[in-house]
């Protein structure tokens, strides 16, 4: 399995303003997927969102979101799926080894698969904010 | 049945500019594909000029030598892209297409659409 | 930049000869590969997409293979209506490849 480089920690307010990127980039994701008619969200995938045994900002699992967003990648070249795959990128601040993600093979899967994870990524977009948020507010108080 | 008409397409001198159009009709814009321009010149192979990603946002994608003469856009509401070009040069000359691409490899075949083309000629 | 290396840039065949076409991309496409035939004064006409998949109303005798960087086409048994030239194209939109078409492989009667 494939390791990524080590970065430096970011500061909480850099990390609030790139989920805050990604937030807003997983809206206009799901807005695209959304345009295919006919499918169905999959109870099959389920994307890894926040550990509950870590504190903000270190709580997103971001290797393996970022995992999940290159394997839609391989089955979509949407603009924004680049740019949010850069973003994860920045979140990934120790060696992390790559989650092997099975690619679904059958037309209607890979819709499936791309809109469920589409989905649950706009939802942890949304659950990382509030957790960062609130953790800030309880480190000031 | 989907096609893509180019118009716009005619004879300028060295330093002019024109639009050229590529209509959609048959299907309407919407957020499963790339509209790319594409040129051949006489006798010669064929060269991508640049994209726009018809969905949330208009992301471009041009080749190298394009930038800054080519302009890409789009009117959703004329299911029209357009293509500007300025200071245009002899070398400009060929046949302009205008084609659709998938963004997903799903069905993909349905997506891969070409119109017939609009001829440019630039010469004094 | 970028580049797509089609090989090679013309051949001659027989009906009935085996033909194979070479693509090779600078980095790593994922399989964005198209492949195309044209005739003098039309349209590219799709062969194969996504590197293996067989375009509909595409005859079987074409094929394609490849994955990463280098791509194939194969023609299985020329026929007189397969003479014209072959264009591969990478799709792969976004990152630092964009689209971008190979130079060409005209085939010619021998």
């Known amino acids: 399995s494939h390791t990524l480089p080590v970065r430096l920690l970011r500061p909480s307010d850099d990390v609030q303003k790139i989920v805050e990127e990604l937030q807003s980039l997983s809206k206009m994701l799901l807005k695209d997927v959304e345009e295919e008619k006919g499918v169905l969200v999959s109870q099959n995938y389920t994307l890894p969102c926040l550990s509950p045994d870590a504190q903000p900002p270190n709580n997103i699992h971001s290797p393996a979101i970022r995992a999940y967003l290159k394997t839609i990648r391989q089955l979509d070249n949407k603009s924004v799926i680049d740019e949010i795959i850069e973003h994860l990128d920045k979140l990934i601040f120790q060696d992390a080894p790559e989650t092997n993600i099975s690619v679904p093979t059958d037309t209607h899967e890979c819709k499936r698969f791309i809109l469920t994870i589409s989905q649950q990524f706009s939802e942890c977009m949304d659950l990382a904010l509030k957790s960062l948020t609130s953790g800030a507010q309880q480190a000031t108080t | 049945q989907s096609q893509l008409v180019e118009s716009g397409g005619g004879s300028v001198q060295p330093g002019g500019s024109l639009r050229l159009s590529c209509a959609a009709s048959?299907?309407?814009?919407?957020?499963?594909?790339?509209i790319c321009w594409v040129r051949q010149a006489p006798g010669k192979g064929l060269e991508w000029i640049v994209c726009i990603y018809i969905g949330s946002r208009a992301d471009t994608y041009y080749a190298p030598w394009a930038k800054g003469r080519f302009t890409i856009s789009k009117d959703n509401s004329k299911n029209t892209v357009y293509l500007q070009m300025n200071s245009l040069r002899a070398e400009d000359t060929a046949t302009y297409f205008c084609?659709?691409?998938?963004?997903?490899?799903?069905?993909?075949?349905?997506?891969?659409?070409w119109g017939q083309g609009t001829q440019v000629t630039v010469s004094s | 930049a970028f580049q797509l290396t089609q090989s090679p840039s013309s051949l001659s065949a027989s009906v009935g000869d085996r033909v194979t076409i070479t693509c090779q991309a600078s980095?790593?496409?994922?399989?964005?590969l198209a492949w195309y035939q044209q005739k003098p004064g039309k349209p590219p006409k799709l062969l194969i997409y996504?590197?293996?998949k067989l375009a509909s109303g595409v005859p079987s005798r074409f094929s394609g293979s490849g994955s990463g960087t280098d791509y194939t086409l194969t023609i299985s048994s020329l026929q007189p209506e397969d003479f014209a030239t072959y264009y591969c194209?990478?799709?792969?939109?976004?990152?630092?490849?964009?689209w971008g078409f190979g130079t060409g492989t005209k085939v010619t009667v021998k």
């Open positions: 996504q590197a293996s």
């Open positions: 980095q790593s496409i994922d399989s964005w």
């Open positions: 194209q990478t799709y792969y939109g976004g990152g630092h490849i964009g």
């Open positions: 048959g299907f309407s814009f919407s957020a499963n594909y790339w």
């Open positions: 084609a659709r691409f998938s963004s997903g490899i799903y069905d993909l075949d349905r997506f891969f659409l």
